[in-house]
């Protein structure tokens, strides 16, 4: 309907349009995480704050044990910032005693789970070499992207180290999407 | 009106639609920033360009005096990237001292001030600890993220220090946001 | 048509709507890079993977040659991540052999070619210098802004140095675009 | 220090117009958003409406909108209330009021009597 | 408009007692704000987004509640508390007040 104007005649075509306002969107926030169990070889999962502070869902877009569920399919934004703190990075201490310097890293890892795969399918990583000279050293890695989703997808955050994830405030550690 | 052709028929339920192309838009760009005062114990907020090069505000978003103005409520998308350059930073020279290493940081905060709480409101925050080998440094720090705003809400940028903040290209440093 | 009821009124002004489904879209992945000739004194540009895993274009969103063909004018929210990675950056060699330490560094730059303009345009661009300590490294350059674009522009993503760029993963390294 | 110090004619006409001005001091006007509260005598606290000077945006009491006007002059870092057709119900002591960075801060108050 | 009913209206408490005043908002608000007003003063902000201590607060004031209910504490009544107590709600158009409630030294 580009440059066209919408008019109400009965031989106007109609595509399925939608009040943006009810879109599935959601924004979660960081909470102190509890260990929990993860698969062999799959990085842990964050879990997360939906509805105090900053943190919402809504229209049909909920969240449940560490995943956001996809009501609706379509092209969604997917975002997640997840900031890392800890003390000096091994490789230094690995370094200064001589051995092989390999770098301890930090990644972050927007993970899809879907009925229609059997495998979780990653579909944003950030990852990071860290190799501080600071004995105490702190960094986001931020991700975003558009992905083609369907209803029932699961999303997660998984991360390297949840030890190592900032939980203070809200407004460094989060994770969001909402369908375009 | 998911999946539902929307023609003019009387027994249509109408949600309330809108073109895209007038929700309020906006992207600012750096300029060279001047001294200005802050609340002790906040950043100081950097102020932009909003009319040459690449920055533009539209359908009644405004900027002024370093603030974004949201005309309306609604979901938007926040996002800014601040480009922070220096020379080596103290924490080296520190270490060489041979005293405590605590690292240099820089730091942005997207802000929200709204006139139903009396609080500035941080919306998101990038902040990595700088500890630099080398003399001169740079790199930058992206946010972006989606909030519930009001309509009165504005929005403005801080930085841990102005005079880190490269403004020098329209394409380092910047802020913007739209309406969902 | 804020917060007013869009019924088949034949008083009621339409403005131009469309679907949110047929707007332009793409999202591009990674792939190994071929060696190509580039303008002097202009980053050379990644090419893409654009249909296969979790590339796709749509609605008349090309991608052809390194560029992503904008086929409506409008308001695009352009991305990029670059993952960069290499081994022990010279900046740290030189500094152990006493010479200036002048650092290395890593730059992604999202760049318009306009015909209306004979001069490529720099939207976005993340540069960070790299000085590091260990052996191996690795980061991501993330990139995210709104931009007015016009039909018949092109899109493209320069980084300053091709072999430094991460194409092992498709959601390590990517670059998309959308009409908002 | 932050100030806001509000002044103005403490004695109005019935059926004419209530002008009171806030000046401040010790912030930017710009950074808040300015409130006018009232208190009549024996009374609660009753919000009268704010204007955000960055922009000049306002929202009032519906209760007192046909006749509230607050406006802002951020080059003399003052807000000025206006009031129309008053009644002896007027008669109050008039605050301005700073919100959006803590701490919320209040005028001392400027008592306005209206009588003929 | 969103009402807020406080109450008591006035109370009279022994110094070193727990005093309590509630706040009832007519529908659900996000925040609740707590003033005091000594006579012919103005008033000054205790507590925000209902239970951050506002800056320079003695520790012994308090807030708490969500929803439509709220309710404001002093641990521990001092002859310095002797004043006016009002609730307030700014989320809703217009920002209304409770009618507030006076606090006495028996």
């Known amino acids: 309907l580009k440059g066209q104007e919408f008019a109400p005649s009965h031989q106007q075509v109609y595509a399925p349009l939608r009040a943006d306002g009810d879109k599935p969107r959601a924004h979660l926030t960081v909470v102190r995480q509890t260990p929990t169990q993860h698969f062999k070889n799959q990085f842990p999962a964050l879990h997360w704050e939906h509805e105090l502070g900053l943190a919402f869902t809504k229209n049909r877009m909920n969240y449940t044990n560490k995943f956001l569920l996809i009501p609706e399919s379509g092209d969604y934004f997917i975002y997640s910032q997840v900031t890392f703190r800890g003390m000096t990075s091994e490789c230094s201490e690995i370094r200064q005693a001589g051995r092989p310097n390999k770098p301890d890293s930090i990644t972050v890892v927007i993970t899809k789970v879907t009925d229609s795969y059997p495998e979780p399918t990653q579909l944003l990583m950030g990852t990071k070499s860290v190799c501080e000279v600071g004995s105490n050293w702190f960094q986001p890695i931020y991700l975003g992207a558009m992905f083609s989703l369907q209803e029932g997808d699961k999303l997660m955050v998984n991360v390297s180290d949840i030890s190592l994830v900032d939980y203070t405030k809200e407004d460094k550690t989060f994770f969001g999407a909402f369908l375009l | 009106l998911k999946g539902q052709e929307f023609a003019p028929s009387h027994q249509q339920v109408y949600a309330p639609l809108r073109a895209d192309g007038d929700k309020p838009r906006a992207h600012l760009t750096v300029v060279r920033q001047t001294p200005t005062q802050h609340f002790k114990n906040q950043f100081p907020a950097l102020h932009w360009e909003h009319e040459l090069g690449l920055a533009f505000t539209k359908n009644r978003m405004n900027y002024t005096n370093k603030f974004l103005l949201i005309p309306e409520s609604g979901d938007y998308f926040i996002y800014s990237q601040v480009t922070f350059r220096g020379m080596t930073s103290e924490c080296s020279e520190i270490r060489q001292a041979g005293r405590p290493n605590k690292p240099d940081s820089i730091t942005v905060v997207i802000t929200k001030v709204t006139d139903s709480y009396p609080e500035p409101t941080q919306l998101l925050m990038g902040t990595k600890s700088v500890c630099e080998v080398g003399s001169n440094w740079f790199q930058p720090i992206y946010l972006g993220a989606m909030f519930s705003l009001q309509e009165g809400d504005k929005l403005m940028v801080n930085v841990s220090d102005i005079s880190l903040v490269d403004y020098t290209k329209e394409d380092k440093t910047f802020f913007g946001a739209f309406l969902l | 048509l804020k917060g007013q009821e869009f019924a088949p009124s034949h008083q009621q002004v339409y403005a131009p709507l469309r679907a949110d489904g047929d707007k332009p879209r793409a999202h591009l992945t990674v792939v190994r890079q071929t060696p190509t000739q580039h303008f002097k004194n202009q980053f050379p540009a990644l090419h893409w993977e654009h249909e296969l895993g979790l590339a796709f274009t749509k609605n008349r969103m090309n991608y052809t040659n390194k560029f992503l063909l904008i086929p409506e004018s409008g308001d695009y929210f352009i991305y990029s991540q670059v993952t960069f990675r290499g081994m022990t950056s010279e900046c740290s060699e030189i500094r152990q052999a006493g010479r200036p330490n002048k650092p290395d560094s890593i730059t992604v730059v999202i760049t318009k070619v306009t015909d209306s303009y004979p001069e490529p345009t720099q939207l976005l661009m993340g540069t960070k210098s790299v000085c590091e300590v260990g052996s191996n490294w690795f980061q991501p350059i993330y990139l995210g802004a709104m931009f007015s674009l016009q039909e018949g522009d092109k899109l493209m993503v320069n980084v300053s140095d091709i072999s430094l760029v991460d194409y092992t993963k498709e959601d390590k390294t990517f670059f998309g675009a959308f009409l908002l | 220090q932050v100030q806001l110090q509000e002044s103005g004619p403490g004695l109005v006409r019935p059926s004419q117009t209530l002008s009171l001005t806030c000046t401040v001091s010790?912030?930017?006007?710009?950074?808040?958003?300015m409130h006018w509260v009232r208190q009549r005598p024996g009374r609660g606290l009753e919000w009268m409406g704010r204007?955000?000077?960055?922009?000049?945006?306002?929202k009032y009491n519906p209760s007192l909108k046909s006749r509230v006007t607050i406006t802002r002059d951020t080059s003399k870092n003052q807000v000025s209330l206006r009031l129309s057709s008053v009644t002896a119900a007027d008669t109050a002591v008039y605050y301005c009021?700073?919100?959006?960075?803590?701490?919320?801060?209040w005028g001392q108050g400027s008592l306005v009597t209206v009588s003929s | 408009d969103i009402q807020m009913t406080q109450s008591p209206s006035s109370l009279s408490a022994s110094v070193g007692d727990r005093v309590t005043i509630t706040c009832r908002a007519s529908?659900?608000?996000?925040?609740m704000y707590w003033y005091q007003q000594k006579p012919g003063k103005a008033p000054k902000l205790l507590i925000y987004?209902?239970?951050n201590l506002a800056s320079g607060v003695p520790s012994r004031f308090s807030g708490s509640g969500s929803g439509t209910d709220f309710t404001f504490t002093i641990s521990s009544l001092q002859p310095e508390d002797i004043a006016t107590y009002y609730c307030?709600?700014?989320?809703?158009?217009?920002?209304?007040f409770g009618q507030g409630t006076k606090v006495e030294i028996k």
């Open positions: 009021v700073r919100s959006g960075g803590l701490p919320d801060e």
């Open positions: 204007i955000d000077p960055a922009g000049g945006h306002t």
């Open positions: 307030q709600q700014w989320e809703g158009n217009p920002r209304t």
């Open positions: 529908q659900g608000v996000e925040y």
């Open positions: 987004g209902a239970s």
């Open positions: 010790g912030f930017d006007m710009q950074d808040t958003y």
